[in-house]
């Protein structure tokens, strides 16, 4: 179908627009463009006759239009009045007419906006500020950005005047940010320069850092004071009430017990004239040595070796602590601590036991940590994985197999084809394969440290003909209204389409049927007895197709409510009573009878010869399906008249 695409749809004044023609028929006599939604000679822009390659301007031609041999129309130096619909009228060589209409809209380019403010230095919790985006522009959308993010939701923020004005009520220090406004229309978006709101506040109560108040003799004491304040606060330090210095930081090297005492920081805001102080008490203690870890085995082998880690030095009356992966020790039968907690033994190490391990010595003041120790656990190789998982390839493609086995140190890899060694690399690449490349591809992974090797074998088939597929199922005996079944079409093959049939028909549309994995997998949710059908999968590519043998789904169901026959409930004395019970079930249910609540026999048929009025009562048939675990029953009243 002939269509017109406007590129772009929204056009900026002064720019150009291309009315691009799609699906132009062949064998044309000519074509003509019109302003508007129909062929109207008074509004013809330009006509073009193929044979003469001659363009003829029409009444609506402005001199800004160029028609191309492919019928596309370029309009240059766009003006507002150009907005609207344009119709292309195409005349084919058999004088059959076709027409198509396109449209575009024209918008002005926006100028760069700016922000005006009614208050340059507002005071926290007191003043309001109104920002206005200039200039006022018609058909423009106004947006605001705070620190290059869109406006947060806040009852203190209010947009007005068509979003041109942003008002911040009761400013806080958190409003000290970069504010930008943006004007947008469909052809342009312009952002203003940033305006930084300067809110005056503080000082708040100063914070002295670090927070710890206990130090060891010989350390450096480096205290820093900070109070939130605008303009920034001026700081003074006092020790035990005596002025020390007017700095933000107080530094005392190589402290002793004599440096214990009260440390006061005073913050002063010169603009507000306010002062705030904070006091911290510092205690200085004598220093213990830094601990370290020794190990009895630096390269343990997974599942074979044990490792004993010992925290040095040995100090009397000291508490030893351990951390693994920066966490306290997990509870595990493979982790054992000595009586004094100084030695940590890992029994039968695994690859997950690498650490890091740290020990610590605790005193009144703090815990001294050792440097971390990492175990180099030798493991693997595990069974290698060959990827990709395809087993079937077409001739002419490239075969690229990659092998990976978890191993420390990293495994060395070898490739064998049909038992013949090929190369010692992790990847095997064979270009432009043929049927001769079919065979058994073995990846061997070797760990030089442990001397262990593991192999994985993959059968690769190279054939133009697809193999006969087969269906694998994750549930051979699903239970009705309970289980789901996933059928998978094997093998997985490159560039192959997978198809499914049920009872020889294509898949019905059902919310319980779902295709996934590139249509390789068919999942039946909440199976019902009606799903017990023959399922066939098919694979096809550009040269061949094949179907699997059918797989019949065996759905376990029931037992349904049983039916007792015959339906008669009145009998004459002396007659034979022959009741048969039936319940739909897979597998067939087990039957049992009760007369007036008393168990009788485990048969489907209940027979009583020559009944009398003594045989009056309730006859119950019980059915149970051992496979589904479900039971059912029905009760029938029998009356025997003399």
């Amino acid at each position: 179908k002939l269509t017109i695409e406007s590129t772009p749809f929204n056009v900026a004044e002064g720019k150009e627009v291309l009315l691009l023609v799609h699906n132009l028929p062949q064998h044309l006599f000519g074509y003509s463009w019109y302003k508007g939604e129909r062929v109207d000679g008074n509004r013809q822009i330009i006509g073009y006759v193929i044979g003469t390659q001659q363009a003829t301007p029409g009444p609506a031609y402005s001199g800004r239009e160029i028609i191309y041999p492919n019928a596309s129309l370029l309009i240059q130096n766009i003006i507002q009045n150009d907005t609207g619909f344009y119709t292309l009228h195409v005349i084919k060589s058999d004088l059959v007419n076709e027409e198509a209409t396109g449209q575009f809209r024209v918008y002005p380019e926006l100028p760069k906006p700016s922000i005006s403010s009614n208050n340059s230095k507002p005071v926290e919790d007191k003043d309001a500020v109104a920002f206005t985006c200039e200039p006022e522009t018609q058909d423009a959308t106004y947006l605001w950005w705070v620190n290059n993010q869109s406006l947060p939701v806040s009852p203190r923020l209010q947009l007005s005047n068509g979003n041109r004005t942003l008002t911040l009520f009761n400013v806080t220090r958190n409003d000290t940010a970069s504010y930008k406004c943006e004007t947008q229309n469909p052809v342009s978006a312009r952002r203003s320069d940033s305006v930084i709101l300067n809110v005056l506040y503080g000082p708040d109560a100063p914070t002295i850092s670090p927070l710890n108040t206990s130090y060891r003799s010989g350390e450096n004491l480096n205290l820093s004071c900070h109070a939130a304040s605008n303009p920034p606060a001026q700081y003074s330090w006092f020790v035990n009430g005596t002025f020390q210095q007017s700095t933000q930081e107080l530094f005392i090297p190589n402290i002793t017990v004599n440096n214990s005492g009260s440390y006061t920081c005073q913050a002063h805001n010169s603009d507000t004239g306010l002062n705030r102080t904070t006091v911290t008490t510092i205690t200085v203690y004598a220093e213990p040595p830094k601990p370290f870890i020794t190990s009895n085995n630096s390269n343990p082998v997974e599942d074979e070796d044990a490792v004993a880690l010992t925290c040095e030095p040995e100090i009397q009356n000291t508490t030893y602590l351990w951390w693994v992966n920066n966490q306290s020790l997990p509870v595990s039968p493979r982790l054992q601590l000595s009586n004094d907690n100084r030695t940590l033994t890992l029994l039968s190490v695994t690859r997950n036991d690498v650490g890091p391990y740290e020990c610590g010595i605790q005193n009144e003041l703090s815990v001294d940590h050792s440097d971390p120790v990492i175990l180099n656990v030798l493991y693997g190789p595990d069974d290698p994985t060959i990827s990709p998982s395809y087993t079937y390839y077409r001739p002419g493609v490239n075969l690229s197999l990659s092998c990976h086995a978890a191993s420390n140190p990293p495994a060395q890899y070898s490739w064998l084809i049909d038992g013949n060694i090929q190369q010692h690399t992790q990847e095997l690449f064979i270009s432009n394969i043929t049927e001769k490349n079919s065979g058994l591809y073995t990846c061997q992974a070797n760990n030089s440290a442990s001397g262990h090797s593991r192999t994985t074998v993959k059968t690769i088939t190279v054939s133009a003909e697809l193999p006969k597929p087969s269906i694998s199922s994750n549930n051979s005996k699903p239970v009705e209204d309970k289980d789901a079944v996933a059928f998978t079409c094997e093998p997985e093959a490159q560039n192959t389409t997978y198809l499914w049939w049920v009872n020889g028909q294509s898949l019905p549309v059902s919310p319980r049927l779902q295709l996934s994995n590139g249509n390789r997998t068919l999942t039946l949710f909440n199976v019902t007895r009606n799903d017990a059908r023959a399922y066939v999968c098919g694979i096809q590519n550009s040269v061949s197709a094949n179907r699997s043998d059918p797989v019949t789904l065996d759905v376990l169901y029931g037992p349904d409510t049983p039916i007792i026959s015959p339906p008669d409930s009145s009998y004459l004395s002396g007659a034979n009573l022959n009741l048969s019970c039936h319940s739909a079930s897979n597998p067939s249910p087990q039957y049992s009878w009760r007369i007036n609540g008393i168990p009788q026999q485990h048969t489907q048929v209940l027979f009583i010869a020559k009944i009398t009025p003594n045989n009056n009562g309730t006859y119950a048939c019980f059915v149970s399906n051992l496979a589904t675990g479900r039971n059912n029953s029905i009760v029938k009243s029998i009356t025997v008249s003399a």
């Epitope: 129909r38 062929v39 109207d40 003469t52 060589s93 004088l95 059959v96 007419n97």
Partner: antibody, heavy 117, light 107 residues
Framework: QVQLVQSGAEVKKPGSSVKVSCKAS????????ISWVRRAPGQGLEWMGH????????GYAQKFQGRVTITADESTSTAYMELSSLRSEDTAVYYC??????????WGQGTLVTVSS | DIQMTQSPSSLSASVGDRVTITCRAS??????LNWYQEKPGKAPKLLIY???SLQSGVPSRFSGSGSGTDFTLTISSLQPEDFATYYC?????????FGQGTKLEIK
């Protein structure tokens, strides 16, 4: 101004053929299509077919298919309409006309063809 | 083929009258419709093209309207030279078809 000048009147016997010419002047011959239309006595206008001179593409009304042949000679800016197996009901004024972007705009003066035994 | 039906087939009117001729297509032809005037012994003359566009040199008392299947030719004030036969013609399909004509006579 485009002018289409047709050949003179013809008298023909039933079963014979007639060939009417139409010469274009005052414009580019191949920037349009040439249509042929006839009007039989007491009847309305009836379109017969057309040709695009530049590429020789021709189309015919079903009624005349097989009996009419429309050709064009670019070198002389002349179009021709030949109607064969003439019968008395083919007696009519035959017009050539130019088709451009808006259907037929300019007409020839007409050629009377009389079919009589 | 697309059939074109004109009505009325003939019409008597006086100089100065306003006259309307209608043309109906058997299927939608968008605005691909022309109106022609034919006088005895003369070739037809194009009056209106594309349903509503006035051909250059044609008096403005002639006007056309319509789209789809129903079209109208209007002469706002009849002049003596306007008495003639008027044809509509569709060019939506390359099998051009004409209406049967409307003969406009002096009352």
């Amino acid at each position: 101004q485009v002018q289409l000048v047709q050949s003179g009147a013809e008298v023909k016997k039933p079963g014979s053929s007639v060939k009417v010419s139409c010469k274009a002047s005052g414009g580019t011959f191949h920037d349009g299509a040439i249509s042929w239309v006839r009007r039989a006595p007491g009847q309305g206008l009836e379109w017969m077919g057309h040709i695009i001179p530049i590429d020789g593409t021709a189309g015919y009304a079903q009624k005349f298919q097989g009996r009419v042949t429309i050709t064009a000679d670019e070198s002389t800016s002349t179009a021709y309409m030949e109607l064969s197996s003439l019968r008395s009901e083919d007696t009519a004024v035959y017009y050539c006309a130019r088709y451009r972007f808006y259907g037929i705009d300019y007409w020839g003066q007409g050629t009377l063809v009389t079919v009589s035994s | 083929d697309i059939q074109m039906t004109q009505s009325p087939s003939s019409l008597s009117a006086s100089v100065g009258d306003r006259v309307t001729i209608t043309c109906r297509a058997s299927q939608s032809i968008s605005s691909y419709l022309n109106w022609y005037q034919e006088k005895p012994g003369k070739a037809p003359k194009l009056l209106i093209y594309a349903a509503s566009s006035l051909q250059s040199g044609v008096p403005s008392r002639f006007s056309g309207s319509g789209s789809g299947t129903d079209f109208t030719l209007t002469i706002s004030s009849l002049q003596p030279e306007d008495f003639a036969t008027y044809y509509c013609q569709q060019w939506r399909s390359h099998l051009f078809t004409f209406g049967q004509g409307t003969k406009l006579e002096i009352k």
